[in-house]
């Protein structure tokens, strides 16, 4: 058993049929010694008396808010949550496996640049009695600070018969060094509580591996005289790290016909312009990627050929 | 070439070669073999390899003030990785394919380190750690980790040389 926060405790249980459970001793936070009784949740049934209460925690019915009283007055509360371990593996019932980039991916994170700011998000089908708390650091043995905000519900989607809820959180490394080569990964820890079930989820990454630039901005076409060719130009996104001579991007320019089956013409360039042939009804798209490290491509910025 | 006393390197040549190194490091990575182990091998080799750290002067301001600290750090790293790529980790079982980019990568690391340091001048170099893989699966795991770490190192080096070529070239 360990303390999650003041008066909230997590009991770790091996979860299998007829498991013995864990013996837990609760102590009433009071100077009083006599006449103390214990109850669980809203029930008035007295579970025991005395300053301490010993219980065998085996299932969710044994978890909840234990309250000690004296003469009708509440002295203190202890909320017990359960953390299930099945066959040596902690349960992951609350969050949905996003399966990208690999199985057992519950948290996904992205950064728009090297400033040390990043966003993480996760999915669940649970709509009520759900709380999240997020902590982060750079490294784990001698952790350096990362400050995270509160997790917020950022999207709701309908997936078949189920509603899916997306939560996200923004974090910022306290003393980021954008030009350095990271040697210790960022660790993100999410505590999830649904009713009386506790779970924790972690992700470990380097900022360089979660970089996804915003799409190029100001995408423009300039027709070339007496030619089907056009000059496409664009600019670095505002959110990208500066100076651009140091934090350089590379670009992919694509000409795509109306039909998805039509052959795509692609050009790769380090410049912020390119000359391409503009077919009727086609569109021109440009996306960006870090020039020296193959993290994610940005989403496409597009303009129609006409 | 970076010469003792602090004259400028051939920024443009270094830029071209470091960008080539980036490409080679990424093309070598998937070719060192099928690898599920990398998903689980969470302990980093990072304690064992040199890094371009915050105080090494490799940021734009540090390069403007005095690029020598940074260039020395890059040189150290290049020599270190060049030795690793020539070690038993890459030459031992399982054998690399004959056309593996690791050979080119090895040669390019040496080439860039020579551009930075002429004959007769010696910056300190870091000892290769004893990573002591005794099994082929351990070598394979280390190849992945070393190449991942090299990708990060050469990305910073390439940024340094690109910025130097754009702003510090005579």
């Amino acid at each position: 058993i360990w303390e999650l926060k003041k008066d909230v405790y997590v009991v770790e249980l091996d979860w299998y049929p007829d498991a013995p459970g864990e013996m837990v001793v609760l102590t009433c936070d009071t100077p009083e010694e006599d006449g103390i009784t214990w109850t669980l949740d809203q029930s008035s049934e007295v579970l025991g008396s005395g300053k301490t209460l010993t219980i065998q925690v085996k299932e969710f019915g044994d978890a909840g808010q234990y309250t000690c009283h004296k003469g009708g007055e509440v002295l203190s509360h202890s909320l017990l949550l359960l953390h299930k371990k099945e066959d040596g593996i902690w349960s992951t019932d609350i969050l949905k496996d996003q399966k990208e980039p690999k199985n057992k991916t519950f948290l996904r994170c992205e950064a728009k640049n090297y400033s040390g700011r990043f966003t993480c998000w996760w999915l669940t089908t649970i709509s009520t009695d759900l709380t999240f708390s997020v902590k982060s650091s750079r490294g784990s043995s001698d952790p350096q600070g990362v400050t995270c905000g509160a997790a917020t519900l950022s999207a709701e989607r309908v997936r078949g018969d189920n509603k899916e809820y997306e939560y996200s959180v923004e974090c910022q490394e306290d003393s980021a060094c954008p030009a350095a080569e990271e040697s210790l990964p960022i660790e993100v820890m999410v505590d999830a509580v649904h009713k009386l079930k506790y779970e924790n989820y972690t992700s470990s990454f380097f900022i360089r591996d979660i970089i996804k630039p915003d799409p190029p901005k100001n995408l423009q076409l300039k027709p070339l005289k007496n030619s089907r060719q056009v000059e496409v130009s664009w600019e670095y996104p505002d959110t990208w790290s500066t100076p651009h001579s140091y934090f350089s991007l590379t670009f992919c320019v694509q000409v795509q016909g109306k039909s998805k089956r039509e052959k795509k013409d692609r050009v790769f360039t380090d410049k912020t312009s390119a000359t391409v042939i503009c077919r009727k009804n086609a569109s021109i798209s440009v996306r960006a990627q870090d020039r020296y490290y193959s993290s994610s491509w940005s989403e496409w910025a597009s303009v129609p050929c006409s | 070439r970076a010469v003792p006393g602090g004259s400028s390197p051939a920024w443009t040549q270094c830029q071209q070669l470091s960008q080539k190194l980036c490409t080679l490091a990424w093309s070598a990575h998937p070719l060192v073999g099928h690898m599920d182990l990398r998903e689980e091998g969470d302990e980093e080799t990072t304690n064992d390899v040199p890094h371009i750290q915050c105080g090494d002067g490799c940021d734009p301001q540090g390069l403007r003030d005095n690029s020598q600290f940074c260039l020395q750090r890059i040189h150290q790293g290049l020599i270190f990785y060049e030795k690793l790529l020539g070690s038993d980790i890459f030459t031992g079982e399982p054998s690399l394919l004959p056309d593996s980019p690791v050979g080119q990568l090895h040669a390019s690391l040496l080439g860039l380190s020579q551009l930075l340091q002429p004959e007769g001048h010696h910056w300190e170099t870091q000892q290769i750690p004893s990573l002591s893989p005794s099994q082929p699966w351990q070598r394979l795991l280390l190849r992945f980790k070393i190449l991942r770490s090299l990708q990060a190192f050469v990305a910073v080096a390439a940024r340094v040389f690109a910025h130097g070529a754009a702003t510090l070239s005579p």
Epitope: - | D36, G41, E93, S95, S134, Q135, W137
Partner: antibody
């Protein structure tokens, strides 16, 4: 499908040399390492040695001086030679494939049925 | 050599009940976070069969009632609900250092 089949003498005399052949099919010896493991009657498993994809070998230090493992990739055969046999070497000898280096980390994923070798005069 | 000590030597479990076998290594069998510990099942008159590789990965074709956990020196094989066909001897094996070594085996029987 993947198969490994051991062949060789059932009976050898003390001080003689044992030669066992493992013939494999369904995979190439250039892609997978082969180990030899033995099991004395009613006892546990003992690893003898391995031949890697590139032809290098590692042996159990306890019997290294008596053991040689070689292979012929084109014939898909691995040969175990063990000199100076003794009655304590009586065991079932298994030829075993080591799983893909990058996934299995030294786990042996396919085993032959084994061949019982008795050492007796 | 790395010595693997299995416990218990034998185990009698009722059908449908849980069976747990432990394997302790005399030194760590982890290398950069990878546990080179594997589990085998051997039935009478048959060669051993790989069940779990790298401590916790279920070999293809093996029923999900088998699971493995652990790292460094302490490992566990669990059969969540014992079936009649699970009666066998179970071995752990390490491949972190030469020579590869096996545990002494644990015999699982029906109570």
């Amino acid at each position: 499908q993947v198969t490994l089949k051991e062949s060789g003498p059932v009976l050898v005399k003390p001080t003689e040399t044992l030669t066992l052949t493992c013939t494999v099919s369904g995979f190439s010896l250039t892609q997978y390492a082969i180990s030899w493991v033995r099991q004395p009657p009613g006892k546990g498993l003992e690893w003898l040695g391995v031949i890697w994809t590139g032809g290098g070998t590692n042996y159990n230090s306890g019997i290294k001086s008596r053991l040689t493992i070689s292979k012929d990739n084109s014939k898909s055969q691995v040969v175990l030679t063990m000199t100076n046999m003794d009655p304590v070497d009586t065991a079932r000898y298994y030829c075993v494939r080591e799983g893909d280096y990058g996934s299995y980390a030294g786990a042996m994923d396919y085993w032959g049925q084994g061949t019982t070798v008795t050492v007796s005069s | 050599d790395i010595v693997l000590t299995q416990s218990p030597d034998s185990l009698a479990v009722s059908l449908g009940e849980r069976a747990t076998i432990n394997c302790r290594a005399s030194e760590s069998v982890d290398y950069y976070g990878i546990s080179s510990m594997h589990w085998f099942q051997q039935k009478p008159g048959q060669p051993p069969k790989l069940l779990i590789y790298r401590a916790s990965n279920l070999e293809s074709g093996i029923p999900a009632r088998f699971s493995g956990s652990g790292s460094r020196t302490d490992f566990t094989l669990t059969i969540s609900s014992l079936q009649a066909e699970d009666v066998a001897v179970y071995y752990c094996q390490q491949a972190n250092k030469d020579p590869y070594t096996f545990g002494g085996g644990t015999k699982v029987e029906i109570k």
